[in-house]
Amino acid sequence: QTSVSPSKVILPRGGSVLVTCSTSCDQPKLLGIETPLPKKELLLPGNNRKVYELSNVQEDSQPMCYSNCPDGQSTAKTFLTVYWTPERVELAPLPSWQPVGKNLTLRCQVEGGAPRANLTVVLLRGEKELKREPAVGEPAEVTTTVLVRRDHHGANFSCRTELDLRPQGLELFENTSAPYQLQTFVLPATPPQLVSPRVLEVDTQGTVVCSLDGLFPVSEAQVHLALGDQRLNPTVTYGNDSFSAKASVSVTAEDEGTQRLTCAVILGNQSQETLQTVTIYSFPAPNVILTKPEVSEGTEVTVKCEAHPRAKVTLNGVPAQPLGPRAQLLLKATPEDNGRSFSCSATLEVAGQLIHKNQTRELRVLYGPRLDERDCPGNWTWPENSQQTPMCQAWGNPLPELKCLKDGTFPLPIGESVTVTRDLEGTYLCRARSTQGEVTRKVTVNVLSPRYE
């Protein structure tokens, strides 16, 4: 009868084991071991027992002891079980950012590891087990689906293998994959709101505001604001789940035309963009041209108004004929025209909006001097000793200098309150003088003596 010891062995891959083959008869014709493994016989006294060192055991094996005794041949097998931990435990790569509400499939691949009956694959979120399955197939693959939630943000997912050899008197061997850190996000389907001027004048500044609600995590949102090809540097203010990006836009002559204003919000691997058209226009105030800003009475004056080629002008409320960027009017300058304002109003349509610009010029008409009855009466009769104010107003542009003299020396105090005396009586020559010439007028003052009863 042949026996083997030990009958069952569990050993690490590549390890060695001592196997003893024994027989019950004293003088066996043969006693040995049959195995493909490298073996080395250890010398022992006696014929009915042999010890072999089996080395470099790479896989499960069943070495067989045999003996040939007078009563016949017999065999006995020992069962060598090799154990080893997996060579690869890996979570299939995934984008680090995942939208909330999406089903995320975690896939763990395990290469190698034995004995498979004792090998389990566990998928975890942090320390929480999501799925536990025996390792089956090569490579073994275990999957689970997770509905991504907001509170999963920053969670670590991993895959662990457990080779449990405790029933065999050994320990529990664990291997863990590199963790996958989940970044969850919410980017609403609504595009960002963009508030900006629809039209902007060259050499002015405008303010652009881009905002969006319902973002998570809002601090991770990237905001890109651009006007045409110009990057805008917004100041971003964050709320709990919202942001507001504000930028100042300065436009120059280079920007004239139609520009695309864009606000793009990038969060995770998604983006939302809003596009708006801004028309940048150049519209100088219209030009009011007078033949001469200062003319003498009776001169022909041409007043012209010229504006942007696409503008429509009105001059002193009268539209250009035909309607367009130029208007003019002709007049013969009269004293009444002095200080008259000529106002040109230009209207330009820019992207459906009417833009108005005005320019005013004043005409100066040189005339006079003038002394007439209404403003400088030729006759005054005043009671003696009464208080009177002699009035004589000379007209003209420039305003004339006025002097009223009696006998070439005695002045009449124009505009001053005086007590009427006999000295005041007489004829005065009033002379109004300016750069435009001079005029004279005689003024007579009569003084009435009081009557005594």
Epitope: H224, R231, A253, H308
Partner: antibody
Framework: QVQLVESGGGLVQPGGSLRLSCAAS????????MSWVRQAPGKGLEWVSA????????HCADSVKGRFTISRDNSKNTLYLQMSSLRAEDTAFYYC????????????WGHGTLVTVSS | SSELTQDPAVSVALGQTVKITCQGD??????ASWYQQRPGQAPVLVIY???SRPSGIPDRFSGSSSGNTASLTITGAQAEDEADYYC????????????FGGGTKLTVLG
């Protein structure tokens, strides 16, 4: 569709003058800025001049300032480049191109016209 | 300075991905636009803004930017993509309205 067709190129002596034209169709001409870009044979592109849609604003490269004048006639849908005091280094293909705004990128280009300055 | 710098020449195997770069101070303020010019033809706009393509330009062309560098990427280059590529930007120095890079000659191998 948008079409830009340059004309007026040719051989001219140093110091001479030439006027290039660019006839535009397929878009609202007065709403677009226009530019001239040149390319010397076998060399890269060089911006030359630009004009706003209204024609009120013009810009020129330093290399041609005082010698070249850009203008447009919106009633004829035509862009011009008046070139004077021409030099050998002005020899190039001259392309006209349109852009939504004066300093903007070029959406469409013409096929180009060759200007050769040589004695 | 008002210069945009490009590599003079770049090659790519048919079907592979190639990135053409453009460097310049103005790119910190303005986005680049990219033009393709085949021999004997006028330039054609392929990318503008942050990463916008005009209609008719295949989606294998894309643009990106970081700091003072703009890039044009062709994913899965085709034989017909062999051409000169020019980057172009507003000039932040104020000397010019727009400035071009020196151009990159792209060769598609195989």
């Amino acid at each position: 569709q948008v079409q830009l067709v340059e004309s007026g190129g040719g051989l001219v002596q140093p110091g001479g003058s030439l006027r290039l034209s660019c006839a535009a169709s397929g878009f609202t001409f007065s709403s677009y800025a226009m530019s001239w870009v040149r390319q010397a044979p076998g060399k890269g592109l060089e911006w030359v001049s630009a004009i706003s849609g209204s024609g009120g604003s013009t810009h020129c490269a330093d290399s041609v300032k005082g010698r070249f004048t850009i203008s447009r006639d919106n009633s004829k849908n035509t862009l011009y480049l008046q070139m004077s005091s021409l030099r050998a280094e002005d020899t190039a293909f001259y392309y006209c191109a349109n852009s939504a705004y004066t300093g903007g990128w070029y959406d469409y280009w013409g096929h180009g016209t060759l200007v050769t300055v040589s004695s | 300075s008002s210069e945009l710098t490009q590599d003079p020449a770049v090659s790519v195997a048919l079907g592979q991905t190639v990135k053409i770069t453009c460097q310049g101070d103005s790119l910190r303020t303005y986005y680049a636009s990219w033009y393709q010019q085949r021999p004997g033809q006028a330039p054609v706009l392929v990318i503008y803004g942050e990463n916008s393509r005009p209609s008719g330009i295949p989606d294998r062309f894309s643009g990106s930017s970081s700091g003072n560098t703009a890039s044009l990427t062709i994913t899965g280059a085709q034989a017909e993509d062999e051409a000169d590529y020019y980057c172009n930007s507003r000039d932040s120095s104020g000397n010019h309205l727009r400035v071009f890079g020196g151009g990159t000659k792209l060769t598609v191998l195989g």
